[in-house]
Amino acid sequence: GSSPRSGVLLRGCPTHCHCEPDGRMLLRVDCSDLGLSELPSNLSVFTSYLDLSMNNISQLLPNPLPSLR
C-alpha cells in the first residue's frame, strides 16, 4: 500500500546501506563497497540517488528497478 503522508516516517533504507534524506520526500541511498552480488531488494520508490559502486554486481536484468520513478 502507499505510505501515508507524514514528516515522522522514514523512507525504506536497504539493509547495510546508508541513507540520507533528499528534501521533503526523497532519499539518497549509498550501498557502495558492501560486497553485493545483486541489487538490494527493498529500495524505496522515493530513491533519488543510488550508489552501487565497489560491489560484485556482474549484470543487470532489463528494467532492474521497476519500482523507481
Epitope: G7, V8, L9, L10, R11, P14, H18, P21, R24
Partner: antibody, heavy 117, light 107 residues
Framework: QVQLVQSGAEVKKPGASVKVSCKAS????????MQWVRQAPGQGLEWIGE????????NYNQKFQGRVTLTVDTSTSTAYMELSSLRSEDTAVYYC??????????WGQGTTVTVSS | EIVMTQSPATLSLSPGERATLSCRAS??????LNWYQQKPGQAVRLLIS???RRHTGIPARFSGSGSGTDYTLTISSLEPEDFAVYYC?????????FGGGTKLEIK
C-alpha cells in the same frame, strides 16, 4: 540558528483545556513538519501528532484523537497544540519538535502542564 | 502500534568504556530507526537516523546498527558528557513509538 520557543508552564483543573504555543525561528517554517511529543513525570516519550505547516495537514495518535487539535499560524511561524478534557494523567512536559524526512532534529525546551484539582 | 523495548533500563559504566544499548521492535521495522539523547534540563538531541546515519555534529564514537527487529546503539569510548538517557524510536508506521529509554550512568 534554529530555535523553537514554547509558552510557559500551565496549571489546569480536570476537564479544562490547555493550548501550548511553539514559535519557530531560524528556518523556513513551512518547509518542515511540526511534531508534538509529551513526557509524563519519570516516563518516556509519547508522540501526540504532527502538522505540516504548508497546508495544515495533520496526523494524530489515535490515543489523543478527538481531544487534541494542532494548528499553525504561518504569519508568525507559530505552532499550537490544544488538548481538551484534561485529566490527571495528562500531567507532563509537552514538546514541539521539527521534522523533515522521518527524524526530529530540533526540539523545543518543553512546556510543563500540570492537571490538578 | 509497534512496541519498542530497550535494554538494559540502566547501564552503569566508566568513562573510556564501551557502551552497547539495545532496542527491540515488536515487528520488523525495516531499518527505520532513530536514536535520541536526553539530558536533564536540556533539549532532546538527535544522534542517529535511518539506523546508522549520524546527525550533523554527532561524534564518530556513536554508531548504530541492526536490522529487522533488533537494533543497537554503540558508544565506542564513553566521554563524561555521554551519561544521559537514550531513546530509540521507530519511524516505520504511525504512530511513531519510542522505547522506554536506557539510562547510562557513571559507575
Amino acid at each position: 540558528q534554529v530555535q523553537l520557543v514554547q509558552s510557559g508552564a500551565e496549571v489546569k483543573k480536570p476537564g479544562a483545556s490547555v493550548k501550548v504555543s511553539c514559535k519557530a525561528s531560524g528556518y523556513t517554517f513551512t518547509n518542515y513538519w511540526m511534531q508534538w511529543v509529551r513526557q509524563a513525570p519519570g516516563q518516556g516519550l509519547e508522540w501526540i501528532g504532527e502538522i505540516d505547516p504548508s497546508d495544515s495537514y495533520t496526523n494524530y495518535n489515535q490515543k489523543f484523537q478527538g481531544r487534541v487539535t494542532l494548528t499553525v499560524d504561518t504569519s508568525t511561524s507559530t505552532a499550537y497544540m490544544e488538548l481538551s478534557s484534561l485529566r490527571s494523567e495528562d500531567t507532563a512536559v509537552y514538546y514541539c519538535a521539527r521534522s523533515l524526512s522521518g527524524y526530529v532534529d530540533y526540539w523545543g525546551q518543553g512546556t510543563t502542564v500540570t492537571v490538578s484539582s | 502500534e509497534i512496541v519498542m523495548t530497550q535494554s538494559p533500563a540502566t547501564l552503569s559504566l566508566s568513562p573510556g568504556e564501551r557502551a552497547t544499548l539495545s532496542c527491540r521492535a515488536s515487528q520488523d521495522i525495516s531499518n527505520r530507526l532513530n536514536w535520541y539523547q536526553q539530558k536533564p534540563g536540556q533539549a532532546v538531541r538527535l544522534l542517529i537516523s535511518y539506523r546508522s546515519r549520524r546527525h550533523t555534529g554527532i561524534p564518530a564514537r556513536f554508531s548504530g546498527s541492526g536490522s529487522g527487529t533488533d537494533y543497537t546503539l554503540t558508544i565506542s569510548s564513553l566521554e563524561p558528557e555521554d551519561f544521559a538517557v537514550y531513546y530509540c524510536q521507530q519511524g516505520n508506521s504511525l504512530p511513531p513509538t519510542f522505547g522506554g529509554g536506557t539510562k547510562l550512568e557513571i559507575k
